[in-house]
Interface confidence: medium
Amino acid sequence: MSAQESCLSLIKYFLFVFNLFFFVLGSLIFCFGIWILIDKTSFVSFVGLAFVPLQIWSKVLAISGIFTMGIALLGCVGALKELRCLLGLYFGMLLLLFATQITLGILISTQRAQLERSLRDVVEKTIQKYGTNPEETAAEESWDYVQFQLRCCGWHYPQDWFQVLILRGNGSEAHRVPCSCYNLSATNDSTILDKVILPQLSRLGHLARSRHSADICAVPAESHIYREGCAQGLQKWLHNNLISIVGICLGVGLLELGFMTLSIFLCRNLDHVYNRLARYR
């Protein structure tokens, strides 16, 4: 066996093993997505997290899983069976993914102000329509998750929620905010979480009531809700995690470039496709 053949064999099995790993990873991601779609309650108790935006994540996970499995399958079979058409398709898919990521990176860096404003507009709409539309639960769950994780409330200020007539206390009642705004570590008083399910949500029955984000909490004392708006919270989070984010993006990009290089190298150095196919007759 020549050095070139052993090199090609090494690349072939390297591509196969790594893509097999990504195929398994993709199928796991897909299974998680399907699990959430079918049975949210058991997933929440398994994960043990409050305010998880399940509706969005179930679809994101399922689609990402299928996509990862698809690409990995092309790489696996293409490398193992030494099929140029599959390796070419694998290279093409990775190139498309890489190009999309580069485009997104450029857009994010050049259109930052517009993106920030678009995000603010989406958040404003979510806040204004909170709890009124059963179709909007995905956006509400996502925003609740952001508030809960970043320990913030509203966009600019927690008072952003007071603008929503539906959440405003009537008469002398306290103002209300979603429970994801609550700083649970600031109080030991369990009764402080005066949960008020909106009348609109009661129409949705058990599903709505089991959803954390459907819970509206009274604000008996300012100290019990996060004082910072999420615009500042997001900026802080991005600032603190910038190196990690850039690192992950670079890592993923380099991994894609590596696989692209290996697949095209393997593809170009294979014998003619017909000779290969003849071998498996």
Epitope: A113, E116, R117, E124, H156, Q159, D160, F162, Q163, G169
Partner: antibody, heavy 119, light 107 residues
Framework: QIQLVQSGAEVVKPGASVKVSCKAS????????MYWVKQAPGQRLEWMGY????????TYNQKFKGRATITRDTSASTAYIELSSLRSEDTAVYYC????????????WGQGTLVTVSS | DIQMTQSPSSLSASVGDRVTITCKAS??????VDWYQQKPGKAPKLLIN???TRHTGVPSRFSGSGSGTDYTLTISSMQPEDFATYYC?????????FGQGTKLEIK
């Protein structure tokens, strides 16, 4: 830190125009509306209008519509109010103030610009 | 337009006194009320928004309350730096309107 710095005092003749500027720093200029408020000597504060610096949308108090024009220059993070056909009753201190939304409190204010209309 | 009527127009108080300023709207403004403090020759400063929420950095002696048409600003214990003019404002509907102000003077 967040600052709104207004242009200096102006003395103008009746019938003339004046443009007052308000330079913002320490925050994202396009993310907050800019209000303009008038305070005539010994009088209560009066809301004149506001601009959304992101898209230039303006909302005016009908009382000032036509004689007050609010604009902005996003590259300079500056908001402006131009007052035309000035009369003696326009003599006042004009304040700019930022607000997260239209229907919201004004959390930071400029130092004010005194406009004196005198012949 | 919604009228905001403040009372009293002026008030004399001593350091340590509890002071209450009221503001009455000509129609229900659904807690969309702010309170501002203004010292001579200075710009107004936000104290309370949404009727009862203290703005960042405002001392706890300042508190706001109210609903519907009646709103109150309370200073639990007057300090020398609190002598100023106080304005209420509604931002429920345009044109946003201010009260005529309450001048707090040293007794």
């Amino acid at each position: 830190q967040i600052q709104l710095v207004q242009s200096g005092a102006e003395v103008v003749k009746p019938g003339a125009s004046v443009k007052v500027s308000c330079k913002a720093s320490g925050y994202s200029f396009t993310d907050y509306n800019m209000y303009w408020v008038k305070q005539a000597p010994g009088q209560r504060l009066e809301w004149m209008g506001y601009i959304d610096p992101y898209n230039g949308d303006t909302t005016y108090n009908q009382k000032f519509k036509g004689r007050a024009t609010i604009t902005r220059d996003t590259s300079a993070s500056t908001a402006y109010i131009e007052l035309s056909s000035l009369r003696s009753e326009d003599t006042a201190v004009y304040y700019c103030a930022r607000s997260p939304y239209g229907h919201y409190a004004m959390d930071y204010w400029g130092q004010g610009t005194l406009v004196t209309v005198s012949s | 337009d919604i009228q905001m009527t403040q009372s009293p127009s002026s008030l004399s108080a001593s350091v340590g006194d509890r002071v209450t300023i009221t503001c009455k709207a000509s129609q229900d403004v659904s807690t969309a009320v702010d309170w501002y403090q203004q010292k001579p020759g200075k710009a107004p400063k936000l104290l309370i928004n949404w009727a009862s929420t203290r703005h960042t950095g405002v001392p706890s002696r300042f508190s706001g309350s109210g609903s519907g048409t009646d709103y109150t600003l309370t200073i639990s214990s007057m300090q020398p730096e609190d002598f100023a003019t106080y304005y209420c404002r509604q931002h429920y509907s345009t044109p946003f309107t201010f009260g005529q102000g309450t001048k707090l003077e040293i007794k």
